[in-house]
């Protein structure tokens, strides 16, 4: 999705993206905050489809693990933080009910600020 | 998804999130860059499920529409930019082939920087 670096831009926070299979994921949190099991395969008209997700999170090895890039450090403390969004997935809850639920997955790395006190 | 403001934090970029139905969306871009029609409903074992998506984009009315919050303006130009991710959706392509494809949806608002030249 349109790389800022190609335009000579830098991200305030470094992120990494990867495809994650349901087999790797195993469980997730649904919209009600409950833990559900993510099924490996989804039945479709012509058989089964492997369930997987495109996830983006803050790069733990990146330059910005100590704070965000380009911040005015005199006035702000900063931190890169992974944010989540909701995607629909075929899941099973603790009562063994199988169904399509929205689950939380990592989708971005954003910068959060707190004002520096007592300068 | 865990609001930074509750912890006395501010986002470098202001975003807005909403649920978008396939009926509102109508079309999307798939992973190959082609335009596909997003189907309104998905067949499931007990009938049909309305297809919709959780989308997050930069807030055009927000404080950060002119640039990111908290940036060191002496050294950097900044811009809040909507980024996209991939989610699976039931779609139809221009050849009338219906299938599950990964489509791009807006999932975040991040800050990009460019170095200030000629100071």
């Amino acid at each position: 999705h349109s790389d800022p670096a190609r335009r000579g831009e830098l991200s305030v926070c470094d992120s990494i993206s990867e495809w994650v299979t349901a087999a790797d994921k195993k469980t997730a949190v649904d919209m009600s905050g409950g833990t559900v099991t993510v099924l490996e395969k989804v039945p479709v008209s012509k058989g089964q489809l492997k369930q997987y997700f495109y996830e983006t999170k803050c790069n733990p090895m990146g330059y910005t693990k100590e704070g965000c890039r380009g911040i005015d450090k005199r006035h702000w403390n900063s931190q890169c933080r992974t944010t989540q969004s909701y995607v629909r997935a075929l899941t099973m809850d603790s009562k063994k009910r199988i169904g399509w639920r929205f689950i939380r997955i990592d989708t971005s790395c954003v910068c959060t600020l707190t004002i520096k006190r007592g300068r | 998804h865990s609001d930074p403001a509750r912890r006395g934090e501010l986002s470098v970029c202001d975003s807005i999130s909403e649920w978008v139905t396939a009926a509102d969306k109508k079309t999307a871009v798939d992973m190959s860059g082609g335009t596909v029609t997003v189907l309104e409903k998905v067949p499931v074992s007990k009938g049909q499920l309305k297809q919709y998506f959780y989308e997050t984009k930069c807030n055009p009315m927000g404080y950060t529409k002119e640039g990111c919050r908290g940036i060191d303006k002496r050294h950097w130009n900044s811009q809040c930019r909507t980024t996209q991710s991939y989610v699976r959706a039931l779609t139809m392509d221009s050849k009338k082939r219906i299938g599950w494809r990964f489509i791009r949806i807006d999932t975040s608002c991040v800050c990009t920087l460019t170095i200030k030249r000629g100071r």
Partner: antibody, heavy 119, light 106 residues
Framework: DVQLVESGGGVVRPGESLRLSCAAS????????MSWVRQAPGEGLEWVSG????????YYADSVKGRFTISRDNSKNTLHLQMNSLRAEDTAIYYC????????????WGLGTLVTVSS | EIVLTQSPGTLSLSPGERAILNCRAS??????LAWYQQKPGQAPRLLIY???TRAAGIPARFRGSGSGTDFTLTISRLEPEDFAVYYC????????FGGGTKVEIK
């Protein structure tokens, strides 16, 4: 003999709405996907919107997405195009056209109905 | 998006002559191209699809050829009723038409 007869055209002001209809005969209407194609005065052809045989899937050109809605009534062998928020550039002859089985190309056309958007 | 460019814009010929109309796509569209004929005050009529297959009832003097990005519609001997505007349309992606070629009497 296949016949497609459009109606509902007329003169409207920018921002107003209009509903076009197309009465089909001479073929099994609910076995065919249908489209609307338009032609601005003295200009070329532009595909506007299409709908699958059962009416459950609709598809649109970017220029009308969000403003126009295609629908069909298979019990009455009728195709419709609801046009909202009309603009001067929507002025055209609107043709109802039958799509071929496997692709969005058009084997039969009506004679068209003229829509004029002018203040 | 795929852009179709038709040439020439106008072709001035006499009945009995051969007409050669060109349609170029901005990217590969395999053989997903159709040709239509439109006479003044009439609806378009499908002539050719699949780049070279004649639609039902279309005379053999109309012949389509080409694949990939370059396509040609050839009318071997022009009849009086063939003077019209001709459009190409790609359906490799969502449908788009070329700007048209007018075949007029010289």
């Amino acid at each position: 003999d296949v016949q497609l007869v459009e109606s509902g055209g007329g003169v409207v002001r920018p921002g107003e709405s209009l509903r076009l209809s197309c009465a089909a005969s001479g073929f099994t209407f609910d076995n065919y996907d249908m489209s609307w194609v338009r032609q601005a005065p003295g200009e070329g052809l532009e595909w506007v919107s299409g709908i699958r045989e059962s009416g459950d899937i609709t598809y649109y050109a970017d220029s009308v997405k969000g403003r126009f809605t295609i629908s069909r009534d298979n019990s009455k062998n009728t195709l419709h195009l609801q046009m909202n928020s009309l603009r001067a550039e929507d002025t055209a002859i609107y043709y109802c056209a039958r799509e071929t089985r496997k692709a969005i190309l058009f084997d039969y056309w009506g004679l068209g109905t003229l829509v004029t958007v002018s203040s | 998006e795929i852009v179709l460019t038709q040439s020439p814009g106008t072709l001035s010929l006499s009945p009995g002559e051969r007409a050669i109309l060109n349609c170029r796509a901005s990217q590969n569209i395999d053989s997903d191209l159709a040709w239509y004929q439109q006479k003044p005050g009439q609806a378009p009529r499908l002539l050719i699809y699949g780049a070279n297959t004649r639609a039902a009832g279309i005379p053999a003097r109309f012949r389509g050829s080409g694949s990939g990005t370059d396509f040609t519609l050839t009318i071997s001997r022009l009849e009086p009723e063939d003077f019209a505007v001709y459009y190409c349309q790609q359906y490799y992606d969502w449908p788009r038409f070329g700007g048209g070629t007018k075949v007029e009497i010289k």
